[in-house]
């Protein structure tokens, strides 16, 4: 009675919402037809932007078929938290759950989804819905990776040398230059899991007057350019 393998789709709300919301559920067209009796663990890696709302879904099984619905939440450095709903008694129980931003979307007898309101770095972890039926368990697991947009700055610090920084991103951003120069890149890791990437480049060729720093990140890409001056120039700063 196991859930077939499936492919997933990330749905993100329109940008004009005050707080973006994303839901990781089925791309129904991609569910395979193998309805195996072998109990399967279906896991998905899911990157989600910090400060958005996230909704995690259980397998598509009607409540009438269920005995218990459990969400198991394993966050770094914390004891495992479980939120369980028992259909027979219509009661919910929580064990070791301290984060008030992680809740059922509504009453579990109406909707088994789990929501995280205003996702924070601390929500990095593993989330699993376990649906207990008379014939076995269905699992849906999520490795939640919280994404933090780095702040990007570009400035010239000495003759024909530019510095591009992607500050406090998660995961680390990737910096490239146009045109390519003589570059050195350093990474600085912070205790909250974010990374600052600093790329310093020098151009000996005097016909290079404008250089572009391109920052690639899972939350989006950003390009900044600067004119190489004989003396240190203006500082540029931007969010992705």
């Amino acid at each position: 009675a196991a859930q077939p393998n499936n492919s997933l789709m990330l749905q993100t709300s329109k940008e004009n919402h005050a707080l973006a919301s994303s839901s990781l559920c089925m791309d129904e067209k991609q569910i395979t037809q193998n309805y195996s009796k072998v109990l399967a663990e279906v896991n998905t890696s899911w990157p989600v932007k910090m400060a958005t709302n996230a909704v995690l879904c259980c397998p598509p099984i009607a409540l009438r078929n269920l005995i218990i619905i459990t969400w198991e939440i394993i966050l770094r450095g914390q004891p495992s938290c479980t939120k369980a709903y028992k259909k027979e008694t219509n009661e919910t129980k929580e064990t070791n759950c301290t984060d008030e931003r992680i809740t059922w979307v509504s009453r579990p007898d109406q909707n088994s989804d789990l929501q995280i309101r205003t996702v924070a770095i601390t929500h990095d972890g593993y989330y699993r819905c376990i649906m207990v039926t008379p014939d076995g368990n269905f699992h849906r697991g999520y490795h939640l990776q919280v994404l933090v947009t780095p702040e990007v700055t570009l400035f010239q610090n000495r003759n024909r040398t530019a510095v591009c920084k992607a500050v406090a991103g998660k995961p680390a951003a990737h910096i490239s230059w146009i045109p390519e120069g003589d570059c050195a890149t350093k990474q600085e890791y912070w205790s909250n899991g974010t990374v600052t990437v600093k790329s310093t480049c020098h151009w000996e060729v005097h016909n290079v007057s404008t250089v572009t720093c391109h920052v690639s990140h899972l939350t989006g890409n950003k390009s900044l350019y600067i004119e190489l001056l004989p003396v240190p120039g203006a500082k540029k700063s931007a969010k992705l």
């Epitope: 859930q3 077939p4 839901s23 067209k29 879904c57 598509p60 009607a62 009438r64 078929n65 014939d135």
Partner: antibody, heavy 119, light 110 residues
């Protein structure tokens, strides 16, 4: 393989009751919800209700409440649908159908039982 | 209760052509990213047979000529190309809370 075998055709008089059986085989009987659907001659499908053999839960279509009763016998892996106070418009083929967990779809159906209500 | 309205009521198609049946729900049948909409085929004297589940998934053993699409309130069953033995009634069904069927579409092959 999973199979649902229903009882034979019935002819009943108005006001009487009919009890149709659906015997399951090829799977753990108590693990799956069983639905009943009927189809009047030349008409579409009409959901009547379901029984969950695991815990004996039932849920009936409002239209049939008070007239329909669904029961189960775990010793024979059989579910029953009894319809009382029969009227001529209850003449139909009655089907049982097993609900699969994933997607709540009905992958296995009985062959159907024709119930004729006539004076 | 959710009401499902199928159109057209009947359809005559030539072999090799495409047949399209639509099913409109009175309110959304999508929950948690899944659309609890299924399609069944019923031939005379036989019980219904599951073709498509969760809006777009082909049931095992069903020819790939059958496909389903849609979400929310609007769903479509497509048969392409139609074959002679596809003559049957086709029903959409919602199965999440209380259960309902569309009134059916009769498909005839010219």
């Amino acid at each position: 393989q999973v199979q649902l075998v229903q009882s034979g055709a019935e002819v009943k008089k108005p006001g009487a009751s009919v009890k149709v059986s659906c015997k399951a085989s090829g799977y753990t009987f108590t693990s799956y919800v069983m639905h009943w659907v009927r189809q009047a001659p030349g008409q579409g499908l009409e959901w009547m209700g379901y029984i969950n053999p695991y815990n004996d839960d039932t849920n009936y279509n409002e239209k049939f409440k008070g007239r329909v009763t669904m029961t189960r016998d775990t010793s024979t892996s059989t579910v029953y649908m009894e319809l009382s106070s029969l009227r001529s418009e209850d003449t139909a083929v009655y089907y049982c159908a097993r609900e699969d967990y994933y997607g709540s779809r009905w992958g296995t159906w009985g062959q159907g039982t024709l119930v004729t209500v006539s004076s | 209760d959710i009401v499902l309205t199928q159109s057209p009521a009947s359809l005559a198609v030539s072999p090799g052509q495409r047949a399209t049946i639509t099913c409109r729900a009175s309110k959304s049948v999508s929950t948690s990213g899944y659309s609890y909409m299924h399609w069944y085929q019923q031939k005379p004297g036989q019980p219904p047979k599951l073709l498509i589940y969760l809006a777009s998934n082909l049931e095992s053993g069903v020819p790939a000529r059958f496909s389903g699409s849609g979400s929310g309130t609007d769903f479509t069953l497509t048969i392409n190309p139609v074959e002679a033995n596809d003559t049957a009634n086709y029903y959409c069904q919602h199965s999440h809370e209380l259960l309902t069927f569309g009134q059916g579409t009769k498909v005839e092959i010219k």
